[in-house]
């Protein structure tokens, strides 16, 4: 009996009720491998999901997220709301990053600015809600008499562009 079932190709199932006949998968279902005892129900891309690839008798549907959302989890199992750069998603919606943190993407959490002094460096460009700080040479490298091929750019205030 098992041997008869192993002959059933993808897109069919081995029908125990009909003496191991290979029956085609019914509408809205698929089998991606041969020898299956059942066809599986196609995934449906509804709500915040949109269809990237339609279901066929041999392969499941694939979903993406609609505009304003991004995929999470294996095979886009969840859609999470996008936020702007400089924000993170909380239970109450998108919130600006707290001072000292940044997020340069539409997803994920706000992360602390790099602490330049831990590497013995100085802040070259201040951080913003959207961007991490840029670390420059160490203060010692900037002391009088130290050689530097290019003078360091002046540090600027968060959100300001150089004049």
């Amino acid at each position: 009996l098992q041997d008869l079932c192993s002959n059933c190709p993808a897109g069919t199932f081995c029908d125990n009720n009909r003496s191991q006949i290979c029956s085609p998968c019914p509408p809205n279902s698929f089998s991606s491998a041969g020898g299956q005892r059942t066809c599986d129900i196609c995934r449906q891309c509804k709500g915040v999901f949109k269809t990237r690839k339609e279901c066929s008798s041999t392969s499941n549907a694939e979903c993406d997220c609609i505009s304003g959302y991004h995929c999470l989890g294996a095979e886009c199992s969840m859609c999470e709301q996008d936020c702007k750069q400089g924000q993170e998603l909380t239970k109450k919606g998108c919130k600006d990053c707290c001072f000292g943190t940044f997020n340069d993407q539409k997803r994920g959490i706000c992360r602390p600015w790099t602490n330049c002094s831990l590497d013995g460096k100085s802040v070259l460009v201040n951080g913003t809600k959207e961007r991490d700080v840029v670390c420059g040479p160490s203060p010692a490298d900037l002391s009088p008499g130290a050689s530097s091929a290019t003078p360091p750019a002046p540090a600027r205030e968060p959100g300001h562009s150089p004049q």
């Epitope: 199932f13 081995c14 029908d15 125990n16 009720n17 998968c25 299956q36 005892r37 059942t38 129900i41």
Partner: antibody, heavy 121, light 106 residues
Framework: QVQLVQSGAEVKKPGASVKMSCKAS????????MHWLKQAPGQCLEWIGY????????NYNQKFTDRATLTADKSTSTAYMELSSLRSEDTAVYYC??????????????WGQGTTVTVSS | EIVLTQSPDFQSATPKEKVTITCRAS?????IHWYQQKPGSSPKAWIS???NLASGVPSRFSGSGSGTSYTLTINRVEAEDAATYYC?????????FGCGTKLEIK
């Protein structure tokens, strides 16, 4: 005879998780799909999702995608459902039910006795 | 999702009476399954694929219908038929159930 035996009643606090089991006997576990259903007091029966124990493939009612996780252990012929972030509306009887794997009709021919979950602070 | 509406919600019948329970679908479905549930028990498979009686179901029960309208009929109702009857579809994901018809036998 064919039987589905479910784990005992659970009382949980809001925000907690619960994992219930459904042990199958009397048939070949991998030849049938296992479905989970919810029956809340005074509400209609709701389908949560199913697992194909042969492949591990799962398909969920979108209403439960975020909080229900279905798994199966072929070695013990047991299916599991974990429900997370519990709230009072999750208070219900949860049933496992098998569907004939060689039928295209998706008909629940055998049901477990149900697991009662009470969510209360 | 496909919504199944059962009518009536509640029916009272006397023994030997003919009882008809209707299940209407919001969109056309290929077939309907029926389940019987008694208080304190799990639902039981009763009729599959519109008209096939499950093992052990008395022949006084029958099922019929197509498209959006389906019926479960009990020809000469008996006291043991007192229960709630549910219809179910899977022509479209997700599986959905009617909210049940409670049958009381006087």
């Amino acid at each position: 005879q064919v039987q589905l035996v479910q784990s005992g009643a659970e009382v949980k606090k809001p925000g907690a998780s619960v994992k219930m089991s459904c042990k199958a006997s009397g048939y070949t576990f991998t030849f049938y799909t296992m479905h989970w259903l919810k029956q809340a007091p005074g509400q209609c029966l709701e389908w949560i999702g199913y697992i194909n124990p042969s492949s591990g493939y799962t398909n969920y009612n979108q209403k439960f995608t975020d909080r229900a996780t279905l798994t199966a252990d072929k070695s013990t012929s047991t299916a599991y459902m974990e429900l997370s972030s519990l709230r009072s509306e999750d208070t219900a009887v949860y049933y496992c039910a098998r569907s004939d794997g060689s039928s295209s009709k998706w008909y629940f021919d055998v049901w477990g006795q149900g697991t009662t979950v009470t969510v209360s602070s | 999702e496909i919504v199944l509406t059962q009518s009536p919600d509640f029916q009272s019948a006397t023994p030997k009476e003919k009882v008809t329970i209707t299940c209407r679908a919001s969109s056309s479905v290929s077939y309907i399954h029926w389940y019987q549930q008694k208080p304190g028990s799990s639902p039981k498979a009763w009729i599959s694929a519109t008209s096939n009686l499950a093992s052990g179901v008395p022949s006084r029960f029958s099922g019929s219908g197509s498209g959006t309208s389906y019926t479960l009929t009990i020809n000469r109702v008996e006291a043991e038929d007192a229960a709630t009857y549910y219809c179910q579809q899977w022509s479209s994901n997700p599986f959905t159930f009617g909210c049940g018809t409670k049958l009381e036998i006087k």
